[in-house]
């Protein structure tokens, strides 16, 4: 008996071939011997089966001795043994129809779980293997679960159902709703304008929700809400903003915030959350601000950084075009009695300068100039 696998919602064509290459009488029946369709001369006739409106054949092939049964919009319950009667012969074809669906919406928040459920006919024992867009393979039976979805899981999942050494492939498009970056860090000199950007990693027709930026300043004992906003069809409107600092927010996507001045008291970490309409849970992006200040007080030239820096980073003070006078894994370094000239304060990671502030040291009888 020939086995054919079909996909729910698809069309399948079951073949039946006569030895004579001409149009002769044929019938397709199901396992209950109920006629599905056949011919009378050159006319297609249909029986009383439940496939009536979904069953068809290809009349153009009859003259070649081919009498296919076409079933459209397949249902799981169409799984059956179909019998083609032609030339006093019976050809049996077992059709097994499978369906694979995502447990919920195919638009899921980062960190949520994806469950794929296989619908299969009674008596079948299929195995399923799915390959994610990033090449991760997962195997299972009737259900497959992937916990903690990541941004790289966005895209087409290809799932193969195996039964009786036959395969049928399903493709499911999954959209993971997330920010492009889980975390970002902005390095600024004191007094510079700060731009925070929160690009989304997905595009949808209409985007509605609400968001908030909570900020934990390094110098503060607790975090506070800096801004709350609404999102309606990709248009941003500010609901509430603190007076210090007075953030500005762009009216269009991507979400964009401007801090007029980088100051040591603002250095720290923020968490932007975005709650989307009709979705449980929130999107998160962490943002960090590191602020540098170079100062000269009397005979002491000091360079300081505030904010979430790593112990990998070196803070250095150097006279322009010379090797560093001091270079330490600290957040503050200083030089006593610095010689006159343009001094550079550098925050660097393995030699890559992340932040630089210049200060001009004048001969001892005059005051310093901050460029």
């Amino acid at each position: 008996k020939k086995v054919v696998l079909g996909k729910k919602g698809d069309t399948v064509e079951l073949t039946c071939t006569a030895s004579q290459k001409k149009s002769i009488q044929f019938h397709w029946k199901n396992s209950n011997q109920i006629k599905i369709l056949g011919n009378q001369g050159s006319f297609l006739t249909k029986g009383p089966s439940k496939l009536n409106d979904r069953a068809d054949s290809r009349r153009s092939l009859w003259d070649q001795g081919n009498f296919p049964l076409i079933i459209k919009n397949l249902k799981i319950e169409d799984s059956d043994t179909y019998i083609c009667e032609v030339e006093d012969q019976k050809e049996e074809v077992q059709l097994l129809v499978f369906g694979l669906t995502a447990n919920s919406d195919t638009h899921l928040l980062q960190g949520q779980s994806l469950t794929l459920t296989l619908e299969s006919p009674p008596g079948s024992s299929p195995s399923v293997q799915c390959r994610s867009p990033r090449g991760k393979n997962i195997q299972g039976g009737k259900t497959l679960s992937v916990s903690q979805l990541e941004l790289q899981d966005s895209g087409t999942w290809t799932c193969t159902v195996l039964q009786n050494q036959k395969k049928v492939e399903f493709k499911i498009d999954i959209v993971v709703l997330a920010f492009q970056k889980a975390s970002s860090i902005v390095y600024k000199k004191e007094g510079e304008q700060v731009e925070f950007s929160f690009p989304l990693a997905f595009t949808v027709e209409k985007l509605t929700g609400s968001g908030e930026l909570w900020w934990q300043a390094e110098r503060a004992s607790s975090s506070k809400s800096w801004i709350t906003f609404d999102l309606k069809n990709k248009e941003v409107s500010v609901k509430r903003v603190t007076q210090d600092p007075k953030l500005q927010m762009g009216k269009k996507l991507p979400l964009h915030l401007t801090l007029p001045q980088a100051l040591p008291q603002y250095a720290g970490s923020g968490n932007l959350t975005l709650a989307l309409e009709a979705k449980t849970g929130k999107l998160h992006q962490e943002v960090n601000l590191v602020v540098m200040r170079a100062t000269q007080l009397q005979k002491n030239l000091t360079c300081e950084v505030w904010g979430p820096t790593s112990p990998k980073l070196m803070l250095s003070l150097k006279l322009e075009n010379k090797e560093a006078k001091v270079s330490k894994r600290e957040k503050a370094v200083w030089v006593l009695n610095p010689e006159a000239g343009m001094w550079q304060c550098l925050l660097s990671d393995s030699g890559q300068v992340l932040l630089e502030s210049n200060i001009k040291v004048l001969p001892t009888w005059s005051t310093p100039v901050q460029p």
């Epitope: 600290e330 957040k331 990671d349 393995s350 030699g351 890559q352 300068v353």
Partner: antibody, heavy 119, light 113 residues
Framework: QVQLVQSGAEVKKPGASVKVSCKAS????????INWVRQAPGQGLEWMGW????????GYAQKFQGRVTMTRDTSTSTVYMELSSLRSEDTAVYYC????????????WGQGTTVTVSS | DIVMTQSPDSLAVSLGERATINCKSS????????????LAWYQQKPGQPPKLLIY???TRQSGVPDRFSGSGSGTDFTLTISSLQAEDVAVYYC?????????FGQGTKLEIK
């Protein structure tokens, strides 16, 4: 995991220059620096400087300032250390070293290149 | 520059006994900003490059036997080998990576008594 393979032994006359190469195989260089450390016969270890092979930035110990030059060829994942105006006290094994975490506690060392300065 | 001084210069210990090597820095290598000691210990056998044993003064590098341990903070550090094995015969160096130029101790030669 990065492996560092250095060029072969060199014999030089005083006043000459030597250029030692250090090729990274396995993973290519990440954003971390390659450092150079030397060891004179029967002596301890001496740090010479660093280079970030991705961007070409360098930093040298004051002692070698003006005599040492570190360069790189990104197409071959190779870093070079050139020491000029050689003197007999520069006779040493020169190591290129790397820290896979970026903190400069050196967990990966080249096999060393012996440089002999002799008239 | 930070000067690293090791003691003793050489040490002879019986197999199975404890070996202790000290390292003193001329300035603190404890970062007050990050509360970490930027100190490493290396082992060097003849004809081989040094091998990293300990970093952050007390964290063992992966693959290093647990008989090796590091302790200390600020300016005074110790490398301890709890039960000396024949393969531990080598020269041991401390290194600070807190401030450039990075500097090493002069080395301690460990032998079997």
């Amino acid at each position: 995991q990065v492996q560092l393979v250095q060029s072969g032994a060199e014999v030089k006359k005083p006043g000459a220059s030597v250029k030692v190469s250090c090729k990274a195989s396995g993973d290519t260089f990440s954003d971390h620096a390659i450092n150079w450390v030397r060891q004179a016969p029967g002596q301890g270890l001496e740090w010479m400087g660093w280079m970030n092979p991705k961007i070409g930035n360098t930093g040298y110990a004051q002692k070698f300032q003006g005599r040492v030059t570190m360069t790189r060829d990104t197409s071959t994942s190779t870093v070079y250390m050139e020491l000029s105006s050689l003197r007999s006290e520069d006779t040493a094994v020169y190591y290129c070293v790397y820290d896979s975490s970026g903190y400069d506690a050196f967990d990966i060392w080249g096999q060393g290149t012996t440089v002999t300065v002799s008239s | 520059d930070i000067v690293m001084t090791q003691s003793p210069d050489s040490l002879a210990v019986s197999l199975g006994e404890r070996a202790t090597i000290n390292c003193k820095s001329s300035q603190s290598v404890l970062s007050t900003s990050y509360n970490r000691n930027f100190l490493a210990w290396y082992q060097q056998k003849p004809g081989q490059p040094p091998k990293l044993l300990i970093y952050w003064a007390s964290t063992r590098q992966s693959g290093v036997p647990d008989r090796f341990s590091g302790s200390g903070s600020g300016t005074d550090f110790t490398l301890t080998i709890s039960s000396l094995q024949a393969e531990d015969v080598a020269v041991y160096y401390c290194q600070q990576y807190y401030s450039t130029p990075y500097t090493f101790g002069q080395g301690t030669k460990l032998e079997i008594k």
